[in-house]
Amino acid sequence: MMTGTIETTGNISAEKGGSIILQCHLSSTTAQVTQVNWEQQDQLLAICNADLGWHISPSFKDRVAPGPGLGLTLQSLTVNDTGEYFCIYHTYPDGTYTGRIFLEVLESSVAEHGARFQIP
């Protein structure tokens, strides 16, 4: 039975040209995290494998940095980076947990962080 929950940074906004940290946290389970995948709608951004470390996809290598922790830092943001991001926790023995973050990249300096929320 899957008892864990994923807490994410929720809906967030950031300025064009700036950077943002995408962060998820898995709680309420003793399952072992074997791998965390970070994905956009149709692309893999990065994988953090418990044995092998980080793999950043080639198309994102110049502006994605691993961490902090199991999170991901997006740099040199453009308006095209607006959209959904998913953290996918592969665990044993529970299986897969998925968290969702919506990022809005703004032209102006009115960007501010949204509230944190949970996905069971």
Epitope: Q35, N37, E39, D42, Q43, L44, I47, N49, A50, D51, L52, G53, W54, H55, I56, S57, P58, S59, H90
Partner: antibody, heavy 121, light 107 residues
Framework: DVQLQESGPGLVKPSQTLSLTCTVS?????????WSWIRQPPGKGLEWIGY???????NYNPSLKSRVTISRDTSKNQFSLKLSSVTAADTAVYYC??????????????WGQGTSVTVSS | DIQMTQSPSSLSASVGDRVTITCRAS??????LAWYQQKPGKAPKLLIY???SLQSGVPSRFSGSGSGTDFTLTISSLQPEDFATYYC?????????FGGGTKLEIK
């Protein structure tokens, strides 16, 4: 250039343990790479067996996990495969390969030429 | 485990032809997909990783595309040395799994 060379007996009896070694040359074995074994039965496709990481963590294919051990000897620039309780279904060409996970993820960029193992009495 | 299915299993083509090979995953693998070329008696050679990234030294006539569950390998203009068997591999999650292969033969 990185080179990998498999070695071991070409014939193993059923129920015995298959033991293979992969020697790595032209490369610092202690740096941040993992090392993998893959096999290919005659006329068939490829099957990933498992890997050993630079930190000595191992990960095995669940279909073989109960019979497989991968280890390494950094002083000899070698890593090894042991597969116990073999049957005719384990007859295959066995390949060793490098995993440059940071750059290629789980895609394997350097392979040995393969060694053929037949399980027969 | 994620099953990888390639089609066609064999294909006849001529030098200069444009050829497309398809690989389908039984579940989502995002863009974590590699393509290999294997010639008889030889080890597989990495052509493409992360669905569309060309491995160093591989001719630009090879290209890969796709995401999610459906992927293609395209050879824009077949050369004599391209006749071989091609395999896809998902590197999304272990156990990493391969397709059954597509044998490309001379027509």
């Amino acid at each position: 250039d990185v080179q990998l060379q498999e070695s071991g007996p070409g014939l193993v009896k059923p129920s015995q343990t298959l033991s293979l070694t992969c020697t790595v040359s032209g490369h610092s074995f202690t740096s941040d790479y993992a090392w993998s074994w893959i096999r290919q039965p005659p006329g068939k496709g490829l099957e990933w067996i498992g890997y050993i990481s630079y930190s000595d963590s191992t990960n095995y294919n669940p279909s073989l996990k109960s019979r497989v051990t991968i280890s390494r000897d950094t002083s000899k620039n070698q890593f090894s495969l042991k597969l116990s309780s073999v049957t005719a279904a384990d007859t295959a060409v066995y390949y060793c390969a490098r995993l440059d996970y940071g750059n290629y993820g789980g895609a394997m960029d350097y392979w040995g030429q393969g060694t053929s193992v037949t399980v027969s009495s | 485990d994620i099953q990888m299915t390639q089609s066609p299993s064999s294909l006849s083509a001529s030098v200069g032809d444009r050829v497309t090979i398809t690989c389908r995953a039984s579940q989502h693998v995002s863009t974590a997909l590699a393509w290999y070329q294997q010639k008889p008696g030889k080890a597989p050679k990495l052509l493409i990783y992360s669905a569309s990234s060309l491995q160093s030294g591989v001719p630009s006539r090879f290209s890969g595309s796709g995401s999610g569950t459906d992927f293609t390998l395209t050879i824009s203009s077949l050369q004599p040395e391209d006749f071989a068997t091609y395999y896809c591999q998902q590197h999304y999650i272990t156990p990493w799994t391969f397709g059954g292969g597509t044998k490309l033969e001379i027509k």
